[in-house]
């Protein structure tokens, strides 16, 4: 079977600071040197791109400076962190992996990680 399998956790709870981390692991059918990882958010039937990064195997994963994502890579495993999340960002976050080079191109899409974000309660005013 030449299809690429992508695994990611089913559920992740964001921290009180709005940070969520999860691992995206892929079983590569070929020896890719250039890999593109994209995080997609699916809400209802709408799919939007959250962030994306292309990296050379053995090198670090670099997202754009203004991206809400950071990440590290190790072999066929990518550790992704999404920051600045709020309760309204709760949803299904899909890891998409593309083997860009050398040919042939392969696409792999995970089943998605449901990220739950709970806005912290505002601190009550304290009277002294």
């Amino acid at each position: 079977c030449k299809a690429m399998h992508v695994a990611q956790p089913a559920v992740v709870l964001a921290s009180s600071r709005g940070i969520a981390s999860f691992v995206c692991e892929y079983a590569s059918p070929g020896k890719a040197t250039e890999v593109r990882v994209t995080v997609l958010r699916q809400a209802d039937s709408q799919v939007t791109e959250v962030c994306a990064a292309t990296y050379m195997m053995g090198n670090e994963l670099t997202f754009l400076d203004d991206s809400i994502c950071t990440g590290t890579s190790s072999g066929n495993q990518v550790n992704l962190t999404i920051q600045g999340l709020r309760a309204m960002d709760t949803g299904l976050y899909i890891c998409k992996v593309e083997l860009m080079y050398p040919p042939p191109y392969y696409l792999g899409i995970g089943n998605g990680t449901q990220i739950y974000v709970i806005d912290p309660e505002p601190c009550p005013d304290s009277d002294f």
Epitope: C1, K2, A3, V47, K96, M100, Y105, Y106, L107
Partner: antibody, heavy 118, light 107 residues
Framework: QVQLVESGGGVVQPGRSLRLSCAAS????????IHWVRQAPGKGLEWVAV????????YYADSVKGRFTISRDNSKNTLYLQMNSLRAEDTAVYYC???????????WGQGTLVTVSS | DIQMTQSPSSLSASVGDRVTITCRAS??????LAWYQQKPGKVPKLLIY???TLQSGVPSRFSGSGSGTDFTLTISSLQPEDVATYYC?????????FGQGTKVEIK
């Protein structure tokens, strides 16, 4: 709404060249890979070429490799297909199609007919 | 390259009939399979992706199943507006190959 509009088709002699264009609107063009797909008269769909969102990667069907070149101008929201050394078997309706974020082709243009004949 | 083979190449059925079209990939493509509908003289339209996920706005009488190499498109109750040619497509890897198409007609 998402729109793809092809142009540039016509009748051309074997061995000559033609350039097709695909004007996109209604979405962030620079975020999507775009494909060319063709359909010979009375035949099925044949994938021709794709170009990545930023133009960094291109793939071609074996039948057009070395003769066709796909390109894009993100500042003009336009995709191109330069077709050289045209053959009779290249006669087809040429569609541009958007590769969705999840992979399949979710929006298609209306197509432009290319006829290669002497 | 992955070859996609559809069967039958054409079929004729009555309104209300259940219609099944099969698509076989020459090697495993997991669930990276799409189905398209092309009505006569019209542009192809995405019906189903990920083998079984209905594209937004597509009637629920259409369904897809399968994984690996064998896939099925089912129309649970054929309607006159379903007269079209249906294509399966691999999008697991390049090239993005299509099946040869199945023409559906009304008896």
């Amino acid at each position: 709404q998402v729109q793809l509009v092809e142009s540039g088709g016509g009748v051309v002699q074997p061995g000559r060249s033609l350039r097709l264009s695909c004007a996109a609107s209604g979405f962030t063009f620079s975020s999507y890979g775009i494909h060319w797909v063709r359909q010979a008269p009375g035949k099925g769909l044949e994938w021709v070429a794709v170009i990545w969102y930023d133009g960094s990667n291109k793939y071609y069907a074996d039948s057009v490799k070395g003769r066709f070149t796909i390109s894009r101008d993100n500042s003009k929201n336009t995709l191109y297909l330069q077709m050289n050394s045209l053959r009779a078997e290249d006669t087809a309706v040429y569609y541009c199609a958007r590769g969705s974020l999840l992979g399949p082709f979710d929006y298609w243009g209306q197509g432009t007919l290319v006829t290669v004949s002497s | 390259d992955i070859q996609m083979t559809q069967s039958p190449s054409s079929l004729s059925a009555s309104v209300g009939d259940r219609v099944t079209i099969t698509c076989r990939a020459s090697q495993g493509i997991s669930n990276y399979l799409a189905w398209y509908q092309q009505k006569p003289g019209k542009v192809p339209k995405l019906l189903i992706y990920a083998a079984s996920t209905l594209q937004s706005g597509v009637p629920s009488r259409f369904s897809g199943s399968g994984s690996g190499t064998d896939f099925t498109l089912t129309i649970s109750s054929l309607q006159p507006e379903d007269v079209a040619t249906y294509y399966c497509q691999n999008y697991n890897s390049a090239p993005w190959t299509f099946g040869q198409g199945t023409k559906v007609e009304i008896k």
